[in-house]
Amino acid sequence: CKAMHVAQPAVVLASSRGIASFVCEYASPGKATEVRVTVLRQADSQVTEVCAATYMMGNELTFLDDSICTGTSSGNQVNLTIQGLRAMDTGLYICKVELMYPPPYYLGIGNGTQIYVIDPEPCPDSDF
């Protein structure tokens, strides 16, 4: 296993609709053919997998149909979007990148992006 540097923003604020986007960029010494990207959430010393996708370079990322993640790639940059976030989902979201093919296997883990989610205030009833 070879180490690889992965960069991601330190902080992102989710939109009022519970959508957060950030770029995960990996520094590889060459172009991989097959890449796996995993988003992990760390909160209260617990780490859980949020979503994962394997893609062929030059093709779109394909997450599972019921995944809360979508993404696109350009070169070594992966643009990740996480949807359906609520205040309770605030936490550190870590980008993990694996170069699956060709060998050797490279692994990189980012320092994490702190995503803050604020639930929108309910609209007050209005009389017309």
Epitope: A27, G30, K31, G75, N76, P102, P104
Partner: antibody
Framework: DVQLQESGPGLVKPSQSLSLTCSVT?????????WNWIRQFPGNKLEWMGH???????NYNPSLINRISITRDTSKNQFFLKLSSVTTEDTATYFC????????????WGQGTSVTVSS | DIQMTQSPSSLSASLGGKVTITCKAS??????IGWYQHKPGKGPRLLIY???TLQPGIPSRFSGSGSGRDYSLSIRNLEPEDIATYYC?????????FGSGTKLEIK
């Protein structure tokens, strides 16, 4: 530590074939990476010639496609360059090197071997 | 093929000083660039890959930057052992192509 070492004749006659060997120690050429030949002309210009992958697939520089062949002997952990129909323009220092991925930056190089094409 | 236009072809600087070498690609290479140091009688030595990532064992005096078509290598606190020829190389597409080289001399 990974080491690459080029070897072959230092003098080749025009119209003949140039054959060079790259011997690799410290890493199996079948375990990963792409194994390359690069040459440096007398004016210092570097030219990528081609490579062979860990699983034996080749890519060549289109400028050499009709004259070049890169092969390997996995039992000896060596790979080879054959350049046919050489001219004086092929006089250069020839390097072998490795890189990761289908295209990449070369992290290990041999020290190079000088080849002169002359009658 | 992607052309890599490297400049200057040579430069002279003082010990302890700083130099910057540039490479311009003929198209966007998406940060897929490496930089090498080459001394006579040896193979080139990889300094930096993916624009700015230092190869293990390379001193932090070396740094790289850029995006799109424009890239640069900087060397600060120049030392006598930095005397060499420096090359850029793109790895966005085959065939792999190199810059023409920059010969660094110390005043």
């Amino acid at each position: 530590d990974v080491q690459l070492q080029e070897s072959g004749p230092g003098l080749v006659k025009p119209s003949q074939s140039l054959s060079l060997t790259c011997s690799v120690t410290g890493y199996s050429i079948t375990s990963g990476f792409y194994w390359n030949w690069i040459r440096q002309f007398p004016g210092n210009k570097l030219e990528w010639m081609g490579h062979i992958s860990h699983d034996g697939r080749n890519n060549y520089n289109p400028s050499l496609i009709n004259r070049i062949s890169i092969t390997r002997d996995t039992s000896k952990n060596q790979f080879f360059l054959k350049l046919s129909s050489v001219t004086t323009e092929d006089t250069a220092t020839y390097f072998c090197a490795r890189h990761y991925g289908s295209s990449g930056a070369m992290d290990y190089w041999g020290q190079g071997t000088s080849v002169t094409v002359s009658s | 093929d992607i052309q890599m236009t490297q400049s200057p072809s040579s430069l002279s600087a003082s010990l302890g000083g700083k130099v910057t070498i540039t490479c311009k690609a003929s198209q966007d290479i998406k940060k897929y660039i490496g930089w090498y140091q080459h001394k006579p009688g040896k193979g080139p030595r990889l300094l930096i890959y993916y624009t700015s990532t230092l190869q293990p064992g390379i001193p932090s005096r070396f740094s790289g930057s850029g995006s799109g078509r424009d890239y640069s290598l900087s060397i600060r606190n120049l030392e006598p052992e930095d005397i060499a020829t420096y090359y850029c190389q793109q790895y966005d597409n085959l065939p792999l192509t190199f810059g023409s080289g920059t010969k660094l001399e110390i005043k």
